[in-house]
């Protein structure tokens, strides 16, 4: 049994660190290997991570963090019984993908405005919660090529957009994702989408 | 009530032996990383060793490295110093001291916040 | 490794009166979680240390409010607002950042 993919971390900067690898052949993850990771730092303990399938040969383990901070580095040692396959070490604050926003929400009852609102993936206390920036990405479900997206580079999580850049009478639907200047993130995931129906009174035409 | 009380000590004759003991009652053991600290006549106090709650992490003063071992035996709530080639400068009250929480991936640290009332080893010929 | 310098060594100090010891590391206790990772711990005649200030500045359980922490980094210190008959003894500081924890030497604090 070997690791034909070495591990590869990304930590969503607050609870939760996920690895992904390969072997060189179809692998029972779960029952088979075990991933070992412990805190660099004094009278830190190891933890075991029981991975789970990720297609025939891949892997995947989510590690549990108490919270992150930069100076953070993990050992990790990934074991098949008393075999052990790969040792490697992981800084979480170098390989963060922060966690997707929540809750969009579509507010179409303000004059011709669309106010899309969504929350902040992080509590307060989390040095990423007044860091992220948004990308929100606005499609027509009945033509692929009416397809959008808008940066938000302010800390409020919403976005002000004219109904009336969208084509009145047919549905749309939104999704937005977040990254971190600041510790040079990959993009989260994106949210859940949503869905409304646009329809705004045309301005009556002069003559 | 938190209650650690250490046994073991005496006199022994340097390059002797000694076993201590700090047996422990009031808190989750387990969760928790023990340390020993001594203080010499007269003097003040020295860290000696440490061992995490599972055991699996261990830490000596270079003054004793290759000399003591700490151990712990989770089942009975006790820590042990194995003390061996004793000298005299090993002379002293030894204390063991509740560390911190090291179940937790980052182990939370709220002082040495019990200690035992401590046992006397003296080395001597 | 770190070494713990405290001052004074004997400080005599009259009953109600303030007192201030000072200690100081010869690198930083300061982890980037935050924490100053210092301690204070008292040592009365003929008994064991007992904690009073963990991480720098937080009283530990039972300490009286006339002792308090403060300091960052490599500079620290203990303040006792009114010094009672009940305050002799030894302080220490001590550092948990890394091992080998280190003490400082100790300051006798004693009643005028």
């Known amino acids: 049994m070997k690791v034909l993919q070495e591990p590869t971390c990304v930590s969503d900067y607050m609870s939760i660190s996920t690895c992904e690898w390969k072997m060189n052949g179809p692998t029972n993850c779960s029952t088979e290997l075990r991933l070992l990771y412990q805190l660099v730092f004094l009278l830190s303990e190891a933890h075991t991570c029981i991975p789970e399938n990720n297609g025939g040969a891949g892997c995947v383990c989510h590690l549990l963090m108490d919270d992150v901070v930069s100076a953070d580095n993990y050992t990790l040692d990934l074991w098949a019984g008393q075999q052990l396959l790969w040792k490697g070490s992981f800084k979480p604050s170098e390989h963060v993908k922060p966690r997707a926003p929540g809750n969009l929400t579509v507010h179409t009852n303000v004059s011709d405005t669309l106010l899309l609102t969504w929350s902040n993936p992080y509590p307060p206390d989390n040095y990423l919660y007044n860091h992220l920036t948004y990308a929100v990405n606005i499609w027509s479900e009945n033509d692929p090529a009416d397809f959008r997206i808008y940066n938000v580079t302010y800390l409020e999580p919403s976005l002000r957009i004219a109904a009336s850049t969208l084509k009145s009478g047919i549905s749309y639907r939104a999704r937005v994702r977040a990254w971190a200047q600041c510790y040079n993130t990959t993009w989260s995931e994106w949210s859940p989408s949503t869905k409304w129906h646009n329809s705004y009174r045309e301005p009556f035409e002069q003559h | 009530e938190v209650q650690l009380v250490e046994s073991g000590g005496g006199l022994v004759q340097p390059g002797g032996s000694l076993r201590l003991s700090c047996a422990v009652s009031?808190?989750?053991?387990?969760?928790?990383?023990m340390s020993w600290v001594r203080q010499a006549p007269g003097k003040g106090l020295e860290w000696v060793s440490s061992i995490t709650g599972g055991g699996g992490g261990i830490y000596y003063a270079d003054s004793v490295k290759g000399r003591f071992t700490i151990s712990r035996d989770n089942s009975k709530n006790t820590v042990y110093l194995q003390m061996n080639s004793l000298r005299a400068e090993d002379t002293a009250v030894y204390y063991c001291?509740?560390?911190?929480?090291?179940?937790?991936?980052?182990?939370?640290?709220?002082?040495?916040?019990?200690w035992g009332q401590g046992t006397t080893v003296t080395v001597s010929s | 490794d770190i070494v713990m310098t405290q001052s004074p060594l004997s400080l005599p100090v009259t009953a109600g009166a303030p007192a201030s010891i000072s200690c100081r590391s010869s690198q930083s206790l300061l982890y980037s979680n935050g924490y100053n990772y210092l301690d204070w711990y008292m040592q009365k005649p003929g008994q064991s240390p007992q904690l009073l200030i963990y991480?720098?500045?937080n009283r530990a359980s039972g300490v009286p409010d006339r002792f308090s922490g403060s300091g960052s980094g490599t500079d620290f210190t203990l303040k006792i607002s009114r010094v009672e008959a009940e305050d002799v003894g030894v302080y220490y500081c001590m550092q948990a950042l890394e091992t080998p924890y280190a003490f400082g030497q100790g300051t006798k604090v004693e009643i005028k």
């Open positions: 001291a509740k560390d911190r929480i090291s179940i937790t991936i980052r182990p939370r640290y709220f002082g040495l916040d019990f």
């Open positions: 009031g808190f989750t053991f387990s969760s928790y990383a």
């Open positions: 991480l720098g500045s």
